[in-house]
């Protein structure tokens, strides 16, 4: 009889994760009698995948019934393939004995597993930043194979170019991970903006995966403050308004001070949203002029999103208000203007970063 050969016809097989892999093997002779075993890898550390003779291999099924008369087909099917199954598989013929003796191996079939990347997860900065600042967003996706992968960043549909991407590990592995960090410059209009991380891979059939993050989680838009006085009312009461505009997020505390003493504290809640996602808030304070001998210094103090308080002051001139009548009012508007406020805020952020 001709000498037995063990034929593994495919040098390589590629399978999508979750599917079954068929590894083909045939022997050219019934002689010598003895079982087939399948191993992954070679040498003393090789892993037994299937033995015709003994063992329990729940994921492995022989393609041909081993009890079939004159069987020379020793192909196997491995179910529910995962990236951990990648490797080179060898069909090995044993000669009957006590114990059975290894006789001849096939040339091996390399199994590569096509595994989809996990849904990209985009994470933003731990602390909020204000407009004109640059913040970093990180995108991560794991468990894909093969290694080749494409990642793009978008902000409101526009592709970004300032990002750095790494695929790990650098060497051969059963599966890979990608991590990319994009730098995004914030503007005051970014409350409704979104960054998108898009991952394209051979397993996705041209339908990339996307992960998103809302810039609303990363941005702080400081408020503009304006304090104004309405005309004197007949009952010698002056209505002073503090308008807090264009801020985000909503977390804001407003305190009125009369001559440095706390008069009232309010917390912003359930405010209507502006088109751009920011909020406005107006607070009124009624000052009884007749109760004061001297001018009253009113201060609107705003603490926004845990940042240092910002003040806007306004002086109500008592001398300009005869006690029995209320016509003209003389008021002095003092305190930081809007640009100063923003400068203060910027300084505050530089201090934190």
């Amino acid at each position: 009889e001709e000498e037995l050969q063990v034929i593994q016809p495919e040098k390589s097989v590629s399978v999508a994760a979750g599917e079954s892999a068929t590894l083909n093997c045939t022997a050219t002779s019934l002689i010598p009698v003895g079982p087939i075993q399948w191993f992954r890898g070679v040498g003393p550390g090789r892993e037994l995948i299937y033995s015709q003779k003994e063992g329990h291999f729940p994921r492995v099924t022989p393609v041909s019934d081993p009890t079939k008369r004159n069987n020379m087909d020793f192909s196997i099917r491995i179910s529910n393939i995962t990236p951990a199954d990648a490797g080179t598989y060898y069909c090995v013929k044993f000669r009957k004995g006590s114990p059975d003796v290894e006789l001849k191996s096939g040339a091996g079939t390399e199994l590569s597993v096509r595994a989809k990347p996990s849904a990209p997860v985009v994470s933003g900065p731990a602390v909020r930043a204000t407009a004109e600042h640059t913040v970093s967003f990180t995108c991560e996706s794991h468990g894909f194979s093969p290694r080749d992968i494409t990642l793009k960043w978008f902000k409101n549909g526009n592709e970004l170019s300032d990002f750095q991407t790494n695929v790990d590990p650098a060497g051969k592995s059963v599966s890979y991970s990608i991590r990319s960090t994009a730098r995004v410059v914030l503007t005051r209009r970014d409350v409704h903006s979104q960054v998108i991380c898009e991952v394209a891979h051979v397993t996705l059939q041209g339908d990339p995966l996307r992960g998103t993050a809302n810039l609303s989680e990363a941005i702080r838009v400081p408020p503009f403050l304006e304090v104004t006085q309405q005309s004197m009312r007949a009952d010698n009461q002056v209505n002073v308004t503090c308008q807090v505009t264009k801020f985000y997020p909503q977390r804001l505390q407003l305190t009125w001070l009369e001559n440095g003493n706390v008069s009232r504290t309010e917390m912003a809640s359930a405010l209507p949203e502006n088109k751009d996602g920011t909020y406005n808030w107006t607070s009124w304070l009624l000052v009884n002029v007749s109760a004061h001998r001297d001018d009253v210094k009113l201060t609107c103090q705003v603490e926004h999103d845990g940042q240092p308080a910002v003040n806007k002051s306004f002086s109500v001139k008592v001398s300009a208000h005869p006690k029995e009548q209320g016509s003209n009012t003389a008021a002095e508007n003092t305190g930081t203007n809007e640009r100063d406020y923003k400068d203060d805020d910027d300084k505050h952020h530089h201090h934190h970063h």
């Epitope: 079982p35 063992g55 081993p66 009890t67 004159n70 009957k96």
Partner: antibody
Framework: QVQLVQSGAEVKKPGASVKVSCKAS????????INWVRQAPGQGLEWIAM????????HYNQIFKDRATLTTDTSTSTAYMELRSLRSDDTAVYYC????????????WGRGTLVTVSS | DIVLTQSPDSLAVSLGERATINCRAS??????????IFWYQQKPGQPPKLLIY???NLDPGVPDRFSGSGSGTDFTLTISSLQAEDVAVYYC????????FGQGTKLEIK
């Protein structure tokens, strides 16, 4: 290593039935045929039947087709051979044997079970 | 059914001499290039033991003084130099169809 351990000797009356067991170890029970062979005192070997434990496919010698039934219990890796309507000429040693090469041969044998049929 | 006929029924051979046992099938037991004949040795009080498979292949552990030959319908088991422990009954078996055994050949020392 492959082992086939058979049940103990039986004495039966004519017309009765006997069920001989064969417990396999050292290999995957469902991957190999089990054969049953008998040998009357001072006589030659007589093939009875064979069974594939994976799906209970059986092949019988026509002589025994109506009286013998082969079964397996894969949970205990045990094969059984029941012979009904026993006659005195059924007195024999009954062997189970495993076919290691799927060649319908008998590579490994149990030690045999003596069944004596006597009134 | 294929009938196997062994000859002789019994045989006495001197120690160290060659012993030859024949097995003839009532029709060919060859298929796909293989000869489906097997030889067994049975010693008193023991189960049979496989010696030769597919006509000419020595089962592992069997001394190489045993050999098998033949094709089609005529087959031979040869013991090149008889040893005392070879005293036994020898059976041929075919598996071209469902198995049957030859009637056996008793081998003794002369």
């Amino acid at each position: 290593q492959v082992q086939l351990v058979q049940s103990g000797a039986e004495v039966k009356k004519p017309g009765a039935s006997v069920k001989v067991s064969c417990k396999a170890s050292g290999y995957t029970f469902t991957n190999y045929w089990i054969n049953w062979v008998r040998q009357a005192p001072g006589q030659g070997l007589e093939w009875i039947a064979m069974i594939d434990p994976s799906d209970s496919e059986t092949h019988y010698n026509q002589i025994f087709k109506d009286r013998a039934t082969l079964t397996t219990d894969t949970s205990t890796s045990t094969a059984y051979m029941e012979l009904r309507s026993l006659r005195s000429d059924d007195t024999a040693v009954y062997y189970c044997a495993m076919d290691y090469g799927s060649l319908y041969a008998m590579d490994y044998w149990g030690r045999g079970t003596l069944v004596t049929v006597s009134s | 059914d294929i009938v196997l006929t062994q000859s002789p029924d019994s045989l006495a051979v001197s120690l160290g001499e060659r012993a030859t046992i024949n097995c003839r099938a009532s029709k060919s037991v060859s298929s796909s290039g293989y000869n489906y004949i097997f030889w067994y040795q049975q010693k008193p009080g023991q189960p049979p033991k496989l010696l030769i498979y597919l006509a000419s292949n020595l089962d592992p552990g069997v001394p190489d003084r045993f050999s098998g030959s033949g094709s089609g319908t005529d087959f031979t088991l040869t013991i090149s130099s008889l040893q005392a422990e070879d005293v036994a009954v020898y059976y041929c078996q075919h598996s071209r169809e469902l198995p049957t055994f030859g009637q056996g050949t008793k081998l003794e020392i002369k």
